[in-house]
Amino acid sequence: MAVTACQGLGFVVSLIGIAGIIAATCMDQWSTQDLYNNPVTAVFNYQGLWRSCVRESSGFTECRGYFTLLGLPAMLQAVRALMIVGIVLGAIGLLVSIFALKCIRIGSMEDSAKANMTLTSGIMFIVSGLCAIAGVSVFANMLVTNFWMSTANMYTGMGGMVQTVQTRYTFGAALFVGWVAGGLTLIGGVMMCIACRGLAPEETNYKAVSYHASGHSVAYKPGGFKASTGFGSNTKNKKIYDGGARTEDEVQSYPSKHDYV
């Protein structure tokens, strides 16, 4: 039961995380105008990965896309790439994890296959989350660097009297969305990997107790040691796997001479 819950929760957390990464990537507010020097500006600037926008106090908002690839800073291109890689990996991870979910039965899929798929999706979520966190962090670092650079030459005097104020940018909402979303995807991935460990087929050291109705004596099912020892009825060395959430009745075993009266 715990494994199914962990896997399910990991999937949901990752799903929310990836949705957040997509939202952050599409958002225009990666950087927003710093209003420290002019809190009542009539023109507010903000920028995203794909376009920059200007919102006037009049309510009019104008957004312009970055219609160039070569003219953009390499760091911005890198952030775009990281976010897209994160989304693609996350999307593939989600697709894989849907089929890996223990609560979903697809044909006669082996539990070992589900375990492998869970691990694969978990790793994908972890990498996806790391990509998003890295992308957002690179952009944040770029902002911090530019912020202090523009602060250094905040006012460039013109004729002594006239001032030209350089627009400074600070962290936008998308950065926080990206960090949280990346973290959630990462946590979801870790949960999937933990769930995979619980799903992984391992030989159990004992089998379920079986009873027969002949008289008052109780016959115990032999075996239960490792298959390689040759003890018990599991002569085919078939792995017996307890999914962690099965009842005694559901445990797979092959019949022995003691099983039927």
Epitope: Q33, N38, V40, T41, A42, V43, N45, Y46, Q47, S52, C53, V54, E56, S57, S58, G59, F60, E62, R64, V162, Q163, T164, V165, Q166, T167
Partner: antibody, heavy 118, light 113 residues
Framework: DVQLVESGGGLVQPGGSRKLSCAAS????????MHWIRQTPEKGLEWVAY????????YYADTVKGRFTISRDNPKNTLFLQMTSLRSEDTAMYFC???????????WGQGTLVTVSA | DIVMTQSPSFLTVTAGEKVTMSCRSS????????????LTWYQQKPGQPPKLLIY???TRESGVPDRFTGSGSGTDFTLTISSVQAEDLALYYC?????????FGAGTKLELK
């Protein structure tokens, strides 16, 4: 056709109060920020107050801050300016204006005259 | 606050003449985000409210004759009337539309010679 009609002006004693109204028609009032601007022969045009379409944010000129209150009633398509502690320097023609592209005022009312005098 | 300085205060012209009036701001009105200058020009005739002529320093409002042209960037702006008509005789104001408080120039009065 866009129309803005101010009312409520008149003679007021120093320290007194007055409430100006601006009735809007011919456009979706709730979709535009609105302003009060005043004009005197001495000072020329002077911006007084701004209220956004959703009533937040609100900005005031330092000269009227704490004394004047701008408000709006979107369902009734009306803009208000509550003026208190009036001074002689508040004597002016008061215009309401609609906020437009480029933070400009594209439509103005005809104005209402407020005279603060003993 | 941004201070707007207009010059000259009075301008005496003859009909058909080309006229230029100046407006200077104490701070740049150029917004780096969209490379637009937040300066507006208005025309006011006696007994009337101001009328919007030009916004974003050079964008003519619909219905404004094309003889009115706005130019300039940063802190220095100009309003040009290519061929003055009798109906153009009025007061012309420039306005800072970049930051609150929104400030106006003292105006340039266009008079007939």
């Amino acid at each position: 056709d866009v129309q803005l009609v101010e009312s409520g002006g008149g003679l007021v004693q120093p320290g007194g109060s007055r409430k100006l109204s601006c009735a809007a028609s011919g456009f979706t009032f709730s979709g535009f920020g609105m302003h009060w601007i005043r004009q005197t022969p001495e000072k020329g045009l002077e911006w007084v107050a701004y209220i956004s379409s959703g009533s937040r944010p609100i900005y005031y000129a330092d000269t009227v801050k704490g004394r004047f209150t701008i408000s709006r009633d979107n369902p009734k398509n009306t803009l208000f300016l509550q003026m208190t502690s009036l001074r002689s320097e508040d004597t002016a023609m008061y215009f309401c204006a609609r906020f437009y592209y480029g933070n400009s005022f594209d439509h103005w009312g005809q104005g209402t005259l407020v005279t603060v005098s003993a | 606050d941004i201070v707007m300085t207009q010059s000259p205060s009075f301008l005496t012209v003859t009909a058909g003449e080309k006229v230029t009036m100046s407006c200077r701001s104490s701070q740049s009105l150029l917004n780096s985000g969209n490379q637009k200058n937040y300066l507006t020009w208005y025309q006011q005739k006696p007994g009337q409210p101001p009328k919007l002529l030009i916004y974003w320093a050079s964008t003519r409002e619909s219905g404004v004759p094309d003889r009115f042209t706005g130019s300039g960037s940063g802190t220095d702006f100009t309003l040009t009337i290519s061929s003055v008509q009798a109906e153009d005789l009025a007061l012309y104001y420039c306005q800072n539309a970049y930051s609150f408080p929104l400030t106006f120039g003292a105006g340039t009065k266009l008079e007939l010679k």
